[in-house]
Amino acid sequence: NECPELQPPVHGKIEPSQAKYFFKDQVLVSCDTGYKVLKDNVEMDTFQIECLKDGTWSNKIPTCKIVDCRAPGELEHGLITFSTRNNLTTYKSEIKYSCQEPYYKMLNNNTGIYTCSAQGVWMNKVLGRSLPTCLPECGQPSRSLPSLVKRIIGGRNAEPGLFPWQALIVVEDTSRVPNDKWFGSGALLSASWILTAAHVLRSQRRDTTVIPVSKEHVTVYLGLHDVRDKSGAVNSSAARVVLHPDFNIQNYNHDIALVQLQEPVPLGPHVMPVCLPRLEPEGPAPHMLGLVAGWGISNPNVTVDEIISSGTRTLSDVLQYVKLPVVPHAECKTSYESRSGNYSVTENMFCAGYYEGGKDTCLGDSGGAFVIFDDLSQRWVVQGLVSWGGPEECGSKQVYGVYTKVSNYVDWVWEQMGLPQSVVEPQVER
């Protein structure tokens, strides 16, 4: 009742290993690390066979098949490169995830290297089986913005890609007869969020309550350069409209809001986020130069119907930008206190413009980003949002534009976006 001699499978072994096997002896077949027992097309860790009464084995010896991790999971905004020849996905094969540069960067500077483990799972030393995260890069336009040495720029055409965070926000309130339409600007913070001024998104209500417009009434255009040609732009509807809970329509204090887009927008040379500043109550330093872009810069007397109807001469057809210095807080406060009317420049605001006038962002669009280049991080940072200006004509002498001081609201913004600040460190000015 002796059974025939057994040969272990290639890359495998049999236990116990004996010279002879008799009736009722049992053998366990297993494979080397990185291989699986394969029997009748079924993968298993081990396989047991028994020497039968008639001197035959209960089953044929199975084979050992190399573990296959199969095709790695797709990485949103990322790419996969195979380190091994023929794009092998078997045990000890290596792949590398990378992000779609220069628009996305891997969180925590992860290597992105994954190895096919003995368990048949792609594993990274730090993240384990979790995929890496590609975060949008911020504040790095595909075209370099002009040097900020020269003092005066005014109403200059922006080349496509100079302000890739610039959003045109069109609001059409169809609940009124006739429909109410207006527009403002905003700044892309991530693939799904736009930062803007609260007054742009406040409903045209009859009273002083702060109610946001219905999300159905909001359309956001990104990657837009010339308002006559929206074909190249990405337009998105809003999933959420969030006004700052303390926004005051009497004095425009806390004039900040967010729009969550219905779908994340694909980033590219003409659509990229701007960086948020550090949380700092001082805001931008006096005399620092910043840039603001908008389609409303050159002519403040045109209706919104004209700007959104393509093919007609409108405001500025092409995105314009203006360069402005930050004004010392005390000087701005004094300039407004000297005017008739109840003007209040709060600690949540800063001013920018020239004493002599001539350049002014009240010529820009409400909600547009006042950006300053940060030398440390070599990125553009949104320090202000176009909020309000004095009663005189735009660009009047000693009438400064007033901006929401974004650095006071960084925590609020992250909270609304549902991201802990540590997760999005690359987004923050360093």
Epitope: S175, V177, P178, D180, G184, Q204, R206, I211
Partner: antibody, heavy 113, light 112 residues
Framework: QVQLVQSGAEVKKPGASVKVSCKAS????????IEWVRQAPGQGLEWIGE????????NYNEKFKGRATFTADSSTSTAYMELSSLRSEDTAVYYC??????WGQGTLVTVSS | DIVMTQSPDSLAVSLGERATINCKSS????????????LAWYQQKPGQPPKLLIY???TRESGVPDRFSGSGSGTDFTLTISSLQAEDVAVYYC????????FGQGTKVEIK
């Protein structure tokens, strides 16, 4: 075409309440504000308030807050205005209108003891 | 509240002549966001509800004869009937909807 048809005339005693209805047709009722305006005999027009039927949002003239209540029934495309604690000076024709453009025919409410 | 003051209170004009009604608001009705003046003009004939003639200060409602025109911005507005017809005899009201809406006291237009 857009039409607003209001309920018939009412005679009420001081202290009572009145509920005026306004049935809309010819457009999407839920998506447009319905305003309420009154006109005392031989007098001018006075805005009472408004309701957006789709959301139930309301805005009131301060003068009528607490006394006027607006409701809307989307299933019948009907808006309602209820005015409580009536006094003789509430005698007027009450109009509903779709935002600014189309007016109902008016409902005369007479408050008399 | 915004106070709307119409002038004159009444106006007698010969048929075919121009009628001009003024409306002054206690604060500007120009909305900086929409760049529109939230002022409307209504016509009311005896026993009828008011009828919208002009909105946004100068936009004529469809179906309204072009002899009716609106002008003005900020706080001063005008309704002009370029050539008065017999059917234009009515009371005319301005209404602001910039804020909690308020009406002017009305201007009665008659034939001289």
């Amino acid at each position: 075409q857009v039409q607003l048809v209001q309920s018939g005339a009412e005679v009420k005693k001081p202290g009572a309440s009145v509920k005026v209805s306004c049935k809309a047709s010819g457009y999407t009722f839920t998506g447009k504000w319905i305003e309420w305006v009154r006109q005392a005999p031989g007098q001018g027009l006075e805005w009472i308030g408004e309701i957006l039927p789709g959301t139930g949002s309301t805005n009131y003239n301060e003068k009528f807050k607490g006394r006027a209540t607006f409701t809307a029934d989307s299933s019948t495309s009907t808006a309602y205005m209820e005015l409580s604690s009536l006094r003789s000076e509430d005698t007027a024709v009450y109009y509903c209108l779709r935002s600014e453009d189309v007016w109902g025919q008016g409902t005369l409410v007479t408050v008399s003891s | 509240d915004i106070v709307m003051t119409q002038s004159p209170d009444s106006l007698a004009v010969s048929l075919g002549e121009r009628a001009t009604i003024n409306c002054k608001s206690s604060q500007s009705l120009l909305n900086s966001r929409t760049r529109k003046n939230y002022l409307a003009w209504y016509q009311q004939k005896p026993g009828q509800p008011p009828k919208l003639l002009i909105y946004w200060a100068s936009t004529r409602e469809s179906g309204v004869p072009d002899r009716f025109s609106g002008s003005g911005s900020g706080t001063d507005f005008t309704l002009t009937i370029s050539s008065l017809q017999a059917e234009d005899v009515a009371v005319y009201y301005c209404k602001q909807s910039y804020n909690i809406p308020t009406f002017g006291q009305g201007t009665k237009v008659e034939i001289k």
